[in-house]
């Protein structure tokens, strides 16, 4: 006699970061049939959801309208059919962004580099944070976590050509509040045929997009529940 | 943002009943899942009931479930609260609350998921 069901999946649309009073609407994905979902938040109940007609719908939307402190951390979802309920699904970490200053990134030597060369990130906040973060933007994974009474630095080391890209910092105040990204650093590294934009697998972004928080860490992963368990989630256990 | 004004407190002896009321203005009733909220001295604001914007689905915890019932109409703009079976730990100031979302099915059970909230109105049940 099975006792629970399988887990359901949960992730965040746009994206897990979310700028303060913005909306962010968490997914949870369970079977078809199921009557009720609940999305709990640092171990309470927030939320329940009933779809109907159930047996059409296998993932509910919860809407958080206005994002803030209070809202940011770990939530995770449960789904029922019938009596039987699920086993929880992995935890999903929202963290609240644009949270009172800006910090400013630096590069050393400069942004544009030859392959080989050492290369440090340095990210900047003068308020009360000793945790950075720092973000490569494209579909991949690529997120630093550094320390520092007001400033932190990243050394990626002899750079290659897959370090090209634009990269931006946070302070983080906390696991789950996180300052406003810095202005953007693109770093140019020489040595491959095309250096000024990043390589089709790992695209850049228009400006403006940042504001939505699409671009960073999830782009493309969110949807592929088996691998959201690591990326940028991962700095936040 | 909705005003939200409640009404219907008042004291009851235990075993009784009371009906609480919250009326919306500035804007339809019809945007917003609500909830009701309680709040005694010295405590913690506690979840009462909570229903959706448009299913009307409901959700209440064990504590006032079968007791207390929550509806809405939406053409009156108004929020309702059924409570019977009162005891005296349901003394408590009455909020309702409004969350302007998007869905027509969530219900929210917690307090930080409401933007706008009434002034309360204070239930007393003696016993």
């Known amino acids: 006699q099975q006792q629970t069901l399988p887990k359901p999946f949960i992730w965040a649309e746009p994206h897990f970061m979310v700028p303060k009073e913005k909306q962010v609407t968490i997914c949870c994905q369970g079977n078809y049939g199921a009557v009720e979902y609940q999305l709990h938040f640092e171990g309470s109940l927030f939320a329940v959801d009933r779809p109907k007609p159930p047996e059409r719908i296998n993932k509910v939307q919860f809407y958080i309208p206005d994002m803030n402190s209070r809202m940011a951390g770990q939530y995770s979802c449960i789904y029922r059919v019938g009596e039987l309920w699920s086993e929880p699904s992995n935890l999903l970490d929202l963290v609240v962004t644009e949270m009172y200053d800006t910090p400013t990134l630096s590069v050393h030597p400069g942004p544009e580099v030859i392959s080989g060369e050492k290369v440090t990130f340095y990210c900047r906040l003068d308020t009360a944070t000793s945790m950075f973060l720092l973000l490569k933007e494209g579909r991949s994974s690529h997120v630093q976590r550094g320390y520092g009474k007001v400033q932190a630095e990243f050394p990626l080391g002899p750079v290659t050509t897959a370090h090209r890209g634009t990269y931006r910092c946070f302070g983080s105040y906390n696991n789950h509040a996180w300052s406003f990204p810095s202005e953007p650093v693109k770093l140019l590294v020489t040595g491959d045929i095309e250096n000024t934009s990043l390589a089709p697998e790992d695209p850049t972004f228009p400006a403006d997009t940042w504001g939505t928080y699409l671009l960073t860490t999830e782009t493309g992963l969110q949807k592929d529940h088996a691998l959201w368990d690591h990326t940028a989630q991962n700095l936040l256990r | 943002d909705v005003q939200l004004v409640e009404s219907g407190g008042g004291l009851v002896q235990a075993g009784g009943s009371l009906r609480l009321s919250c009326a919306a203005s500035?804007?339809?009733?019809?945007?917003?899942?609500m909830g009701w909220f309680r709040q005694a001295p010295g405590l913690e604001r506690e979840f009462v009931a909570a229903i959706s914007r448009i299913s009307g689905d409901t959700y209440s915890p064990d504590s006032v479930k079968g007791r207390f019932t929550i509806s809405r109409d939406n053409a009156k703009n108004t929020l309702y609260l059924q409570m019977n079976s009162l005891k005296p730990e349901d003394t408590a100031v009455y909020y309702c609350?409004?969350?302007?979302?998007?869905?027509?099915?969530?219900?929210?059970?917690?307090?930080?998921?409401?933007?706008?909230w009434g002034q309360g109105t204070q239930v007393t049940v003696s016993s």
């Open positions: 609350a409004a969350s302007a979302t998007p869905s027509a099915t969530n219900i929210y059970t917690n307090q930080y998921a409401y933007g706008d």
């Open positions: 500035g804007r339809t009733l019809s945007s917003y899942a």
